[in-house]
Interface confidence: low
């Protein structure tokens, strides 16, 4: 299709190289509420069109995004072409940052229900370059946590090193929806709570002699509680005792409730005690069972081939630690009365002896 | 396509417990609150209360003193109790999911509900 | 706890009219609030979220704007399945609360 009678807007996205970030395009089609679609006669394609919140209603358009290519060649689908960059709904969702993503950006809508339609579009020149290094050390970062409950600000990363009066206008959005109670270079959040968590963009404009462009950031905010005061809670486990079979398998688990931290850090391991011989046990690794706002719930097994007396003997201990402290929970083996005939008991007493020359070949103090 | 079924007896006495549950086909119960709200004949709406699948609870003050919700992963079912009821509880009963929707941001909604059960506490 | 206030109680349109209800917080809740329909005997169904977004499969002709304590809710068209009662509700603090609600009737 022509793309000539597309609305143009010029993006600059100046990356840190210090960090992950993503950069977000929107279609900024105009409101179907003024008009089906754009009608080529109410936009000129001068004109920067009004921002349309696109939301999940089956009534508003889907729209088809293309990169054009330098040389001319035809425009590129870009679901096939490129595999970083995510297209959602409305949105342009570039996953990584990189001087190859410069390049001009088409969308328009998927269905085209009218010959004027045809020229409804908006072309997108993107350029993309690093941040100079000259840049402040302490600029804004992409991934912003804001805690909930108190008083917080949300940062525009281009332009966190100028003072709010230097700062020039800046466009915020959240979630694709134009926020208009600020055009300060930061957001103050008088109580946080968890709906102010998401994706935010903000845009201001920066001139030459020669053009103006559009300078965007894409902020990830977070809203996390504070961190945790407690050290954490073993679950599981509860009993210190657990009785077992000789000669079969068994998997004690251990679980573990680890407050938030923003620097997280768990520790969760099991360990042997035998008389006066203490060792930490390979064992599979941890894995997170439950992740909420407020903690997390981490697992990890301890596997026994087979039980022989001499673990009868043993206490097995899960240890877990976070920056507050540790928690321990021991456990006993017990066997269960009357649970095997003598074959079993000449089974255990085979297993213990070859277990018993494996141990002492390979485990001495733990310090 | 997720439904909430609920099941309780629609007469309880004054003094009495009221007991409903809600069981959730379709879905799982993981990663959601699941709510219960209630509308006394003719009125408004009134929440109740949540539980999350981890069981943690946050229920509405005016009612705290007499509300349980508890909730069973196993059998996909949560449940509501409350105690010492009187001609005032007289509703009908919802239970609802509470979802935290995620559009590159949360927002809570209310997204699935129950069929409703009509409770009258009578003697 | 939060108080909403609708307005009107109740109201008699026209298919094809456009209808306002308006909803306003005893203080500050940002965009956290949320329309539902609710139609005799049956549960409410969710129509507007955080304000101002659609929810999945729900008609155009309804909107949602406003931000901190007053809101409204607009169809734009009224359609015979429109009429119902519509209650707000906020999401910004617990417990969380509804208006009164505001019934739709025909004129």
């Known amino acids: 299709f022509n793309i000539s009678g597309c609305s143009t807007k010029k993006l600059l996205w100046a990356y840190s190289t210090r960090s992950e970030e993503e950069f977000i395009l929107f279609c900024d089609l105009p409101e179907p509420q003024k008009s089906h679609f754009c009608h080529r006669s109410q936009l000129s394609p001068t004109q920067v069109p009004d921002h349309l919140p696109f939301t999940d209603s089956k009534d508003l358009p889907d729209v088809q995004w293309y990169r054009q290519p330098s040389n001319g060649d035809p425009l590129e689908d870009i679901r096939k072409s490129y595999p970083h960059i995510i297209q959602d709904k409305c949105t342009l969702r570039f996953l990584t940052p990189g001087v190859n993503n410069t390049g001009s950006y088409i969308c328009r809508p998927k269905m085209i229900k009218s010959p004027y339609d045809v020229a409804c579009c908006v072309k997108m020149i993107l350029e993309v370059k690093p941040q100079s290094n000259a840049s402040c050390e302490n600029s804004a970062s992409h991934k912003q946590d804001l805690l909930l409950g108190s008083t917080g600000s949300i940062s525009c990363p281009s332009l966190s090193c100028q003072s709010d009066a230097q700062s020039p206008e800046v466009t915020w959005y959240k979630n694709g929806k134009l926020l208009s109670m600020t055009r300060s270079n930061r957001i103050v959040v008088d109580e946080v709570y968890i709906y102010h968590q998401g994706t935010y963009v903000c845009d201001y404009t920066q001139s030459d002699t020669a053009s103006s462009w559009t300078v965007r950031a894409v902020v990830q905010v977070r809203t996390i509680v504070g961190d945790t005061k407690l050290k954490p809670d073993i679950l599981d486990p509860v009993e210190s005792t657990l009785e077992v079979e000789l000669g079969k398998p068994l998997t004690i688990s251990c679980k573990a409730r680890f407050g938030f931290e923003r620097v997280f850090n768990p520790v969760m391991k099991w360990y042997i005690k035998d008389a006066d011989l203490e060792w930490e046990v390979s064992v599979p690794e941890a894995k997170s069972i439950k992740s909420t706002l407020k903690d997390e719930i981490i697992e990890r097994n301890i596997i026994l081939e087979k039980v022989t007396q001499r673990d009868l003997r043993r206490t097995f201990v899960c240890f877990v630690q976070n920056s507050i402290g540790n928690t321990t929970q021991s456990v006993q083996l017990k066997e269960k009365r009357g649970s095997g005939g003598l074959n079993d008991i000449f089974e255990a007493q085979k297993i213990e002896w070859h277990e018993t020359v494996r141990f002492q070949s390979h485990h001495h103090h733990h310090h | 396509q997720v439904q909430l079924q609920q099941s309780g007896p629609g007469l309880v006495k004054p003094s009495e417990t009221l007991s409903l549950t809600c069981t959730v086909s379709g879905g799982s119960i993981s990663n959601y609150y699941w709510t219960w709200i209630r509308q006394p004949p003719g009125k408004g709406l009134e929440w109740i209360g949540y539980i999350s699948d981890s069981g943690s609870t946050n229920y509405n003050p005016s009612l705290k003193s007499r509300v349980t919700i508890s909730v069973d992963t196993s059998k996909n079912q949560f449940s509501l109790k409350l105690s010492s009821v009187t001609a005032a509880d007289t509703a009908v009963y919802y239970c609802a999911r509470e979802t935290i929707v995620v559009r590159g941001f949360y927002f809570y909604v209310m997204d699935v509900w129950g069929q409703g059960t009509t409770v009258t506490v009578s003697s | 706890a939060i108080q909403l206030t609708q307005s009107p109680s109740s109201l008699s349109a026209s298919v094809g009219d456009r209808v306002t209800i308006t909803c306003r917080a005893s203080?500050?809740?940002?965009?956290?609030l949320a329309w539902y329909q609710q139609k005799p005997g049956k549960a409410p169904k969710l129509l507007i979220y955080?304000?101002?977004n659609w929810e999945s499969g729900v008609p155009s002709r309804f909107s949602g704007s406003g931000s901190g304590t007053d809101f409204t809710l607009t169809i734009s068209s009224l359609q015979p399945e429109d009429f119902a009662t519509y209650y707000c509700q906020q999401f910004n603090s617990y417990p969380w609360t509804f208006g009164q609600g505001t019934k739709v009737e025909i004129k």
């Open positions: 203080q500050g809740i940002s965009s956290a």
């Open positions: 955080d304000a101002s």
